[in-house]
């Protein structure tokens, strides 16, 4: 049994679109089949879910249908990209994966990802 | 705000079977593990299980492996603890608790006593 | 399993003294899934730190937390009368979840 490791980069900026993806790997310490992946936002000492998708290894990694991320899993690395993004979301969005099955569960917490965001420019009417 | 009241304890002989209920307010109840800890008079806490999120992944103490069903409702909020072949050595009170979404626990109830004599 | 070991056993001190409890894991613990509660008699655990060195909404900042890999340590800077109580460690990475002993202050 050893600890589980989650890697997240430290810094992403989002596109003028609002949207912005970051990787998070983590070290699996066991032979997991069932995977549950979250993002968390922390703002002060608040967390709050952001999404959330349990997958099966070596299926695709699936959100809700009415959720802001979307991902794709390959090995113990998850693409994760959220979308709809406004300058008020800038924060610290934290990967949590967990182990699920089989037993043990393993939990393994990122140190997060600050994600800037840019509300762009509304064009200006142009007189042509 | 959070809220978490156990109920179900009482004396009960040995060998027999007892139902815990934890019924959750004030939260997202589908959105947490919820886990049952327990501390035997005069002792030290205890972790005893977990149901995770939609209920399809549970995880038990060796000590209660084999006796104990943890379940959940999350039409209901609730949490149950279905222990069966109950044994002097499980005189407790059992707690349920709230694991947030980082994993420590953060909310607890007041606990019910469960007391197995004959 | 994961063995937490905690020392001091029973701690003995006075109002306005330094508090320091220890806990020690049998394997490496994430920091970020260490824990430490505090239980008065008759009272259900409470929240103190969480991620080896957060402390929890409402909890003095007399109370910090710290260490990594497999020793961690609770500190109180000036012990308040209501400080007396059993302080719990806990791991909450790998199942099964498991709690140290405890660690009793209370007053000389």
């Known amino acids: 049994c050893k600890a589980m490791h989650v890697a997240q980069p430290a810094v992403v900026l989002a596109s003028s679109r609002g949207i912005a993806s970051f990787v998070c790997e983590y070290a699996s310490p066991g032979k997991a089949t069932e995977v549950r992946v979250t993002v968390l936002r922390q703002a002060d000492s608040q967390v709050t879910e952001v999404c959330a998708a349990t997958y099966m290894m070596g299926n695709e990694l699936t959100f809700l249908d009415d959720s802001i991320c979307t991902g794709t899993s390959s090995g113990n690395q998850v693409n994760l990209t959220i979308q709809g993004l406004r300058a008020m979301d800038t924060g610290l969005y934290i990967c949590k994966v967990e182990l699920m099955y089989p037993p043990p569960y393993y939990l393994g917490i990122g140190n997060g990802t600050q994600i800037y965001v840019i509300d762009p420019e509304p064009c200006p009417d142009s007189d042509f | 705000q959070v809220q978490l009241v156990e109920s179900g304890g009482g004396v009960v002989q040995p060998g027999r079977s007892l139902r815990l209920s934890c019924a959750a307010s004030?939260?997202?109840?589908?959105?947490?593990?919820m886990h049952w800890v327990r501390q035997a008079p005069g002792k030290g806490l205890e972790w005893v299980a977990v149901?995770?999120?939609?209920?399809?992944?549970?995880h038990y103490a060796d000590s209660v492996k084999g006796r104990a069903t943890i379940s959940r409702d999350n039409s209901k909020n609730t949490l149950y603890l279905q222990m069966n072949s109950l044994r002097a050595e499980d005189t407790a009170v059992y707690y349920c608790?709230?694991?947030?979404?980082?994993?420590?626990?953060?909310?607890w109830g007041q606990g019910t006593l469960v007391t197995v004599s004959s | 399993e994961i063995v937490l070991t905690q020392s001091p056993g029973t701690l003995s001190l006075s109002p306005g003294e330094r508090a320091t409890l220890s806990c020690r894991a049998s394997?490496?613990?994430?920091?970020?899934?260490l824990a430490w509660y505090q239980q008065k008699p008759g009272q259900a655990p409470r929240l103190l730190i969480y991620?080896?060195?957060s402390r929890a909404t409402g909890i003095p900042d007399r109370f910090s937390g710290s260490g990594s890999g497999t020793d961690f340590t609770l500190t109180i800077s000036r012990l308040e009368p209501e400080d007396f109580a059993v302080y719990y460690c806990?791991?909450?990475?790998?199942?099964?979840?498991?709690f140290g002993p405890g660690t009793k202050v209370d007053i000389k």
């Open positions: 608790t709230r694991g947030e979404l980082l994993g420590y626990f953060d909310y």
């Open positions: 991620g080896a060195s």
């Open positions: 394997q490496s613990v994430s920091s970020s899934c």
């Open positions: 149901t995770w999120y939609d209920g399809s992944n549970k």
């Open positions: 806990q791991q909450y990475g790998i199942s099964p979840f498991t």
């Open positions: 004030g939260f997202t109840f589908s959105s947490h593990g």
